[in-house]
């Protein structure tokens, strides 16, 4: 029951995370104009991975795609790639995890197959989340670098005069959406990996106790037996280690001077 819950929750968390990664990738507000020095501005600039937007005081907003591919920074291209890889891996992971869900029965799929699929989807979610976090973090680093470069340019004019036409950009909403979404996808992936351990068939060792009634005295012998789940080869109670104990089929124990009731 706990395994099903963990797997189901992992799937839902990852689904929300991947939806967030897609949303972040499509959003225009990756970087927004810094309004610290000029809170009441007639023009508000903001940019995404795919296009640049301007909102004017009248409320009119114009967005234009980046028509040049070579003119874009390599880091921006890298961020695009990371986000797309994250989405693709996440989507494949979701597809795999749907079939891996314990609550969904598909033919005569064994638990071992479902465990493998759960692990695969979990790893995919983890990598997807890491890609998103990495992409957003790289973009954030670019913004920080550009912000301080812009600030330096602002105050190093002729005789320290301030240049007015210098736009600085700060973190946009998409960055926070991306970080949270990447984190959720990562957590979902970890939960799927944990659920995989519970789904995988295991052989469990138990300490068994053998009681033999013999006349007026009872022999107590501690022993180790392997209780099989039916998946292993040990279907009969064969001795796995000799702790001085014997199976019921072996030599019958006789009373000795050390045996007391």
């Amino acid at each position: 029951m706990a395994v099903t819950a963990c797997q189901g929750l992992g799937f839902v968390v990852s689904l929300i995370g991947i939806a967030g990664i897609i949303a972040a990738t499509c959003m225009d507000q990756w970087s927004t104009q810094d309004l610290y020095n000029n809170p009441v501005t007639a023009v508000f600039n903001y940019q995404g991975l795919w296009r640049s937007c301007v909102r004017e005081s009248s409320g009119f907003t114009e967005c234009r795609g980046y028509f040049t591919l070579l003119g874009l920074p390599a880091m921006l291209q890298a961020v695009r790639a990371l986000m797309i890889v994250g989405i693709v891996l996440g989507a494949i992971g979701l597809l795999v995890s749907i079939f891996a869900l314990k609550c969904i029965r598909i033919g005569s799929m064994e638990d071992s197959a479902k465990a493998n699929m759960t692990l695969t989807s979990g790893i995919m979610f983890i990598v997807s989340g890491l890609c998103a976090i990495a992409g957003v973090s790289v973009f954030a680093n670019m913004l920080v670098t550009n912000f301080w470069m812009s600030t330096a340019n602002m105050y190093t004019g002729m005789g320290g005069m301030v240049q007015t036409v210098q736009t600085r950009y700060t973190f946009g909403a998409a960055l926070f959406v991306g970080w949270v979404a990447g984190g959720l996808t990562l957590i979902g992936g970890v939960m799927m990996c944990i659920a995989c351990r519970g789904l995988a068939p295991e052989e469990t060792n138990y300490k068994a106790v053998s009681y033999h009634a013999s006349g007026h005295s009872v022999a107590y012998k501690p022993g180790g037996f392997k209780a099989s789940t039916g998946f292993g080869s040990n279907t009969k109670n064969k001795k796995i280690y000799d702790g001085g104990a014997r199976t019921e089929d072996e030599v019958q124990s006789y009373p000795s001077k050390h045996d007391y009731v």
Epitope: V43, N45, Q47, V54, R64, T68, L72, N146, T167
Partner: nanobody
Framework: QVQLVESGGDLVQAGGSLRLSCAAS????????MGWYRQAPGKQRDMVAT???????TYADSVKGRFTLSRENAKNTIHLQMNSLKPEDTAVYYC?????????????????WGQGTHVTVSS
């Protein structure tokens, strides 16, 4: 450096016509919004007409039906055709433009204002 050059301001009789022009020089990468604003003596600056890059035009209620704002194709130049002028149209007319500085990443759009051109309508 981007500059807005205005022309066409003059003294005209009531009921007459004028054509104001505004050209954005300095090879900007296209405009977001361009328009005309006016400031009568002792009053605040008001919007007369604006044109967006999508082609939407907005007019102040006081000039609707009399003024027409147009754009010169492939140029960042706008023209304000003013017909049936009234004495209350007397003001300094300013050109305002929101222009992009580039098509690439991190290129911002900025607001620019012209020096103003005087329009006087005598009764």
């Amino acid at each position: 450096q981007v500059q807005l050059v205005e022309s066409g301001g003059d003294l005209v009789q009531a009921g007459g016509s004028l054509r104001l022009s505004c050209a954005a020089s300095g090879s900007p990468f296209g405009f977001v919004v361009m328009g005309w604003y006016r400031q009568a003596p002792g009053k605040q600056r008001d919007m007369v007409a604006t044109l967006t890059s999508s082609g939407a035009t907005t007019y102040a209620d006081s000039v609707k039906g009399r003024f027409t704002l147009s754009r010169e194709n492939a140029k960042n130049t706008i023209h304000l055709q003013m017909n049936s002028l009234k004495p209350e149209d007397t003001a300094v007319y300013y050109c305002r433009a929101v222009l992009r500085s580039g098509d690439n990443w991190m290129a911002a759009a900025n607001e620019y204002w012209g020096q103003g051109t005087h329009v006087t309508v005598s009764s």
